[in-house]
Amino acid sequence: GSSPGPDAIPRGCPSHCHCELDGRMLLRVDCSDLGLSELPSNLSVFTSYLDLSMNNISQLPASLLHRLCFLEELRLAGNALTHIPKGAFTGLHSLKVLMLQNNQLRQVPEEALQNLRSLQSLRLDANHISYVPPSCFSGLHSLRHLWLDDNALTDVPVQAFRSLSALQAMTLALNKIHHIADYAFGNLSSLVVLHLHNNRIHSLGKKCFDGLHSLETLDLNYNNLDEFPTAIKTLSNLKELGFHSNNIRSIPERAFVGNPSLITIHFYDNPIQFVGVSAFQHLPELRTLTLNGASHITEFPHLTGTATLESLTLTGAKISSLPQAVCDQLPNLQVLDLSYNLLEDLPSLSGCQKLQKIDLRHNEIYEIKGSTFQQLFNLRSLNLAWNKIAIIHPNAFSTLPSLIKLDLSSNLLSSFPVTGLHGLTHLKLTGNRALQSLIPSANFPELKIIEMPSAYQCCAFGGCENVYKISNQWNKDDGNSVDDLHKKDAGLFQVQDERDLEDFLLDFEEDLKALHSVQCSPSPGPFKPCEHLFGSWLIR
């Protein structure tokens, strides 16, 4: 053996291999990556684990391993096996794990695997398998996991699977399967996980998943499906469903009616245009629903019975209104993204107490009422950019203590209510041409980034102080000071703010000191210092 020292390794450790005793005085033998072209011959009968992976073994002579009655795991991955004869694994009564991946098998061995009664895990992935003989798995009564991915199968080997009633997880991914026949998995009543991703599946039998009564995860991603997989309706225990990256154009009414346990559905990267309004009803475990660019949707989906939804994204559709009681259906919603729709009016969202992020940009909203966002105590981000908002109720944002990001850019605002926005760190108001007033920076002690319609409005946020320093370097003998600025532009402040001028100026100077770290754009810049901007604004 290869392990040195006085603690003699039991006889039967092949040369160059690494051997150690397991807790039961059985031998773990690692002969991986040694350039072996044949099996070592002097293996101990007491071997429980044998790793022969990453060698150059091209043949498994029948009965060479038959004495290894304690062998529980045999690794033959990454060799050059093209064929495994009948009898190759005879006598391996304890074998639980057999790894044959990354070889050159063109078919599953017809008889070699039969009656391995203890076998629980079988890896046949990454071979060139195009044929699975009907009885090749017979007698594998304990098999739980089967890997057949990354092969050359064109059909599901229906007959071969009939004997695998104990199977719990199987992958047929990365093959060339084009159709799934009715009852293809009809006897796999214990199967929990089924991976069929990265095939060429374009059609599914109406009953192709019938019999999969325990199935919880079904992966149909990256296929050629052009219709919704209605065959899922019998999968009453399904929790995770993926059919993203297909060619599905519509999701029918009551699409998931037979799958009340669904937690996750992945269906992005499909050219979905239409979704039945009842498609996502009665999914009490669903947490996330994301649908982008379904341009034929005109009505907000009915989500009765889908009350645990935490994230709802429905962008790029033609939804023009939300139900008044939308939050009665969605009390657990944390993220609501309805950007790029045709929403004009908003109901009160105050029932959605857990909302943290709302994105309503690129809609047709014209007014924010006082009740719309009332008492959303957890709301952190609100995006209302690119709408037609001309009116915002003075108290619209008054009960949003957690709000840190507010985007109202590219609207029609002429005034902006500041009540309740003292926690903001990000504020965007750019693109509101009618918004000419200065916004008192004292209302935003936490502000880090602000975007304003005009450069002069940045002066209230430390733009002047910063620019003053810069302009001092450019025009050192200018004699400009903050006092000069006050004198020059007193008229402006009187026009823009009705507070006592002196108070305002004191506040303004305090702000300049406190808020020097605020990034405000458009920046006045060195060639347009605040004093000039104020001046030119007065002329305007």
Epitope: Q159, A184, D210, G211, S236, R254
Partner: antibody, heavy 118, light 111 residues
Framework: EVQLVQSGAEVKKPGASVKVSCKAS????????IEWVRQAPGQGLEWIGE????????DYNEKFKVRATFTSDTSTSTVYLELSSLRSEDTAVYYC???????????WGQGTLVTVSS | DIVMTQSPDSLAVSLGERATINCRAS??????????MHWYQQKPGQPPKLLIY???NLESGVPDRFSGSGSGTDFTLTISSLQAEDVAVYYC?????????FGQGTKVEIK
């Protein structure tokens, strides 16, 4: 224990309609198809069609497509067969059965005798 | 429609003897290696009872004297040793394609 319990016998006049119910228990109702089969007196078995309870999925024998309607009520785990425009040759025992292993009919209701007579 | 034809129409067999019923489909009912052919037993006044599914698989709880064989279009139900309680009408059925169809039935009696 899987059970399918059907409604009682009916006597109908020609041209009328009949609605037969089939209440399922002992298994996940929406996970198995329910088949409808009829048997005229002294005759063989004739498949009418099938429904997957709770869904909109149905299949009808072309012969019955116009006159038969299958519905289901998941709240009571009940499936219904309605047959309209009854004729005397519709006199038969109507069975519901569960589509089990590979579509074989593994559990059957006790049958409902529908007699059509003027 | 696929037509199922059973033979014989009736069969009288001595107790303990073998009974064989044939069923022929007008076209193959095989799909991906599965034969979508099932056998049922019906006793008077009772609904049918599933015996064999997919041509040869014994339904749970059915005595092993019943067996099925065949593929494609020709199928056989065999009772290896007829018992008194086996007196009934036996039907074959295909569910390979809609409409699912039954054979006309074979009546098994004791000789």
């Amino acid at each position: 224990e899987v059970q399918l319990v059907q409604s009682g016998a009916e006597v109908k006049k020609p041209g009328a309609s009949v609605k037969v119910s089939c209440k399922a228990s002992g298994y996940t109702f929406s996970a198995y198809w329910i088949e409808w089969v009829r048997q005229a007196p002294g005759q063989g078995l004739e498949w009418i069609g099938e429904i997957l309870p709770g869904s909109d999925s149905t299949d009808y024998n072309e012969k019955f497509k116009v006159r038969a309607t299958f519905t289901s009520d998941t709240s009571t785990s009940t499936v219904y067969l309605e047959l309209s425009s009854l004729r005397s040759e519709d006199t038969a025992v109507y069975y519901c059965a569960r589509g089990g292993h590979y579509g074989s009919l593994d559990y059957w209701g006790q049958g409902t005798l529908v007699t059509v007579s003027s | 429609d696929i037509v199922m034809t059973q033979s014989p129409d009736s069969l009288a067999v001595s107790l303990g003897e073998r009974a064989t019923i044939n069923c022929r489909a007008s076209e193959s009912v095989d799909n991906y290696g599965n034969s979508f052919m099932h056998w049922y037993q019906q006793k008077p006044g009772q609904p049918p009872k599933l015996l064999i599914y997919l041509a040869s698989n014994l339904e749970s709880g059915v005595p092993d004297r019943f067996s099925g064989s065949g593929s494609g279009t020709d199928f056989t139900l065999t009772i290896s040793s007829l018992q008194a309680e086996d007196v009934a009408v036996y039907y074959c059925q295909q569910n390979y394609e809609d409409p699912f169809t039954f054979g006309q039935g074979t009546k098994v009696e004791i000789k």
